[in-house]
């Protein structure tokens, strides 16, 4: 089938990184520069990407792939193949319509980018709050308020019940 | 082919003012949404300021009720007005199209000048 194919076309023997040539009876030639050809049988090279602005190159063109960017730092990629860079924000903030603002009381950001979430709700897990939240951390859950009555202790777990020769250290 | 060309840099004393232009060819300017960056010596790239092709604009914590940011299509150029320049505003300045209307965000299709440099000193 391979072979039938070439006969019927002789642009399938073009390898990548070259472009069938109609203008010189079908010939393979290379990929002229600043383009590129990922596959065989090619008719065209594609433009290589540009990392321009707050882009910059992670990746080179080349004859056969095209050139990859990431970001410049304090931005970060978003979007498939890096489309887009936004800027980050500290901790503590998300990134707004008017810039980075400060997380509200009662959500927090651990990250320079993506949203404030708020904090977990400790008694709906039936647990108490361990370490109050911030801006930048969630509150950490505790023991269930039962659990801290006279005597236990918050910090190791009763023994297993099922473990009668254990004791707590 | 698109082209931004930024013109007005300069060394200027603190407490001065400055206005940058952007000579914007090659595309629908009036339609297009506007923006200036800025990378100071040694560090990364600040989003400063942006403006969409109605008017509305948008700045960066840093240079409100200091810089503005305007548009006269009829010129196809871009402007941004620096007063009370402080040292920390010593940057390279660069003018580029603003596709994603999201502050901060720029998109691979966007365009950018080569920039002017501003510095503040005494």
């Known amino acids: 089938f391979e072979r039938t194919r070439s006969l019927q076309d002789p642009c399938s023997n073009c390898p990548a990184g070259t472009f069938c040539d109609n203008n010189r009876n079908q010939i393979c030639s290379p990929c002229p520069p600043n383009s590129f050809s990922s596959a065989g049988g090619q008719r065209t090279c594609d433009i290589c990407r540009q990392c321009k602005g707050v882009f910059r190159t992670r990746k080179e063109c080349s004859s056969t792939s095209n050139a990859e960017c990431d970001c410049t730092p304090g931005f970060h990629c978003l979007g498939a193949g890096c489309s887009m860079c936004e800027q980050d924000c500290k901790q503590g903030q998300e990134l707004t319509k008017k810039g980075c603002k400060d997380c509200c009381f009662g959500t927090f950001n651990d990250q320079k980018r993506g949203i404030c979430r708020p904090w977990t709700n400790c008694s709906l897990d039936g647990k108490s709050v361990l370490v109050n939240g911030t801006k930048e951390r969630d509150v950490v859950c505790g023991p269930s308020p039962a659990d801290l009555s006279p005597g236990a202790s918050s910090v190791t777990p009763p023994a297993p019940a099922r473990e009668p020769g254990h004791s707590p250290q | 082919e698109v082209q931004l060309v930024e013109s007005g840099g300069g060394l200027v004393q603190p407490g001065g003012s400055l206005r940058l232009s952007c000579a914007a060819s090659?595309?629908?300017?009036?339609?297009?949404?506007m923006s200036w960056a800025r990378q100071a010596p040694g560090k990364g790239l600040e989003w400063v300021s942006g403006i969409y092709s109605g008017g509305s604009t948008y700045y960066t914590e840093s240079v409100k009720d200091r810089f503005t940011i305007s548009r006269d299509n009829a010129k196809n150029t871009l402007y941004l007005q620096m007063n009370s320049l402080r040292p920390e505003d010593t940057a390279v300045y660069y003018c580029a199209t603003w596709g994603t209307l999201r502050f901060g965000v720029w998109a691979e299709y966007d365009h950018w000048g080569q920039g002017t440099l501003v510095t503040v000193s005494s």
């Open positions: 090659g595309f629908t300017f009036s339609s297009s949404a």
